[in-house]
Interface confidence: medium
């Protein structure tokens, strides 16, 4: 069964800036990644970025930079200023479309009492389904 992992980190230099990293553990080829916050995409969550290997990357504020890290993982940096900035307990979700596995999504948030700039290595998060 494929798995998705999500890692959320607060930047040490900008305490209201977040980095979200997501990866897909599966055998298929990734063709689409959607990053959202506030809940799963399609279930109250708001899309922050959509990444497609051929058709490019689209992102919406407060997303600042979305990019592919590897063929099966991405990262997204969020700006931390303004009313739409994330807070420490914000939930971020990543959904991967893979062939032939279909769509898989997982969510994560900043670990409690985490120090800025420090984070544990990514571990597979439980698969969450849109309600």
């Amino acid at each position: 069964t494929p798995e998705v992992w999500v890692q959320v980190r607060m930047e040490a230099t900008e305490l209201s800036s977040f980095t979200i990293r997501c990866g897909f553990l599966g055998s298929g080829s990734i063709s689409l990644v959607t990053v959202s916050w506030g809940g799963p995409n399609g279930a109250g969550g708001t899309t922050l970025a959509v990444l497609h290997p051929e058709r490019g990357i689209r992102q919406w504020a407060p997303a600042r930079q979305a990019r592919w890290e590897t063929q099966s993982s991405i990262s997204l940096i969020l700006e931390g200023s303004g009313a739409s900035s994330p807070c420490a307990n914000t939930t971020f979700c990543c959904k991967f479309a893979s062939f032939p596995e279909g769509s898989w999504e997982a969510c994560g948030s900043l670990p409690p009492s985490s120090d800025p700039g420090l984070s544990a290595p990514p571990t597979p998060a439980p698969i969450l389904r849109a309600d």
């Epitope: 995409n41 596995e101 279909g102 769509s103 698969i127 389904r129």
Partner: antibody, heavy 120, light 106 residues
Framework: EVQLVESGGGLVKPGGSLKLSCAAS????????MSWVRQTPAMRLESVAT????????YYPDTVKGRFTVSRDNAKNTLYLQMSSLRSEDTAIYYC?????????????WGQGTSVTVSS | QIVLTQSPAIMSASPGEKVTMTCSAS?????MFWYQQKPGSSPRLLIY???NLASGVPVRFSGSGSGTSYSLTISRLEAEDAATYYC?????????FGAGTKLDLK
């Protein structure tokens, strides 16, 4: 305008073979995964073959594995389905459909279908 | 393979009514797709990813659900909605379809 046009259907005897074609136009064919889906006389929809955009990986349900072969010619914008050892239960309308990965592989365009009847 | 069971198999409703049909999966699926098929026509994509409307689909259509239970709702039925509706999953290959719900208008 996206168009998918199937051809090659007809009447064939049990154990016989048939090759279906699907001519695609109006989009960059090589960028999309494609499927053959059939609709039985009872109106049930069944996936029979899927091929990724590069054409390297193909997928079949157990009901047709070893009997059906899906292929594509990206230069000709054409999808194929080679069917052999045909059985009466293969009688159906065969549709080709495009998978849009921006829609999480939903089949967003379908052809008009071509009818295959397997009967002695 | 995952079996999708649609209910009811046949339903009848009047224009302006709200109708809901369901799709139950034999094991948990991540997302559901819905297609509409009118007599003599090919299936048409209505909803992808459980709740997202495909291009050109009227907003009276909506989808919801999770796990093994999904539904398609038409908020105010119109004459042109008379058709058969199919659900489809792709959490595990092969992708499978439900047997359909035939919607007739009174």
């Amino acid at each position: 305008e996206v168009q998918l046009v199937e051809s090659g259907g007809g009447l064939v005897k049990p154990g016989g073979s048939l090759k279906l074609s699907c001519a695609a136009s109006g989009f960059t064919f090589s960028n999309f995964a494609m499927s053959w889906v059939r609709q039985t006389p009872a109106m049930r929809l069944e996936s029979v073959a899927t091929i990724v955009n590069g054409g390297i990986n193909t997928y079949y349900p157990d009901t047709v594995k070893g009997r059906f072969t899906v292929s594509r010619d990206n230069a000709k914008n054409t999808l194929y389905l080679q069917m052999s050892s045909l059985r009466s239960e293969d009688t159906a309308i065969y549709y080709c459909a495009r998978h849009d990965d921006f829609l999480y592989y939903a089949m967003d365009y379908w052809g008009q279908g071509t009818s295959v009847t397997v009967s002695s | 393979q995952i079996v999708l069971t649609q209910s009811p198999a046949i339903m009848s409703a009047s224009p302006g009514e709200k109708v809901t049909m369901t799709c139950s999966a034999s094991s948990s699926v991540n997302y559901m797709f819905w297609y509409q098929q009118k007599p003599g026509s090919s299936p048409r994509l209505l909803i992808y990813d459980t709740s997202n409307l495909a291009s050109g689909v009227p907003v009276r259509f909506s989808g919801s659900g999770s796990g093994t239970s999904y539904s398609l709702t038409i908020s105010r039925l119109e004459a042109e909605d008379a058709a058969t509706y199919y659900c489809q999953q792709w959490t595990s290959y092969p992708l499978t379809f439900g047997a359909g719900t035939k919607l007739d208008l009174k």
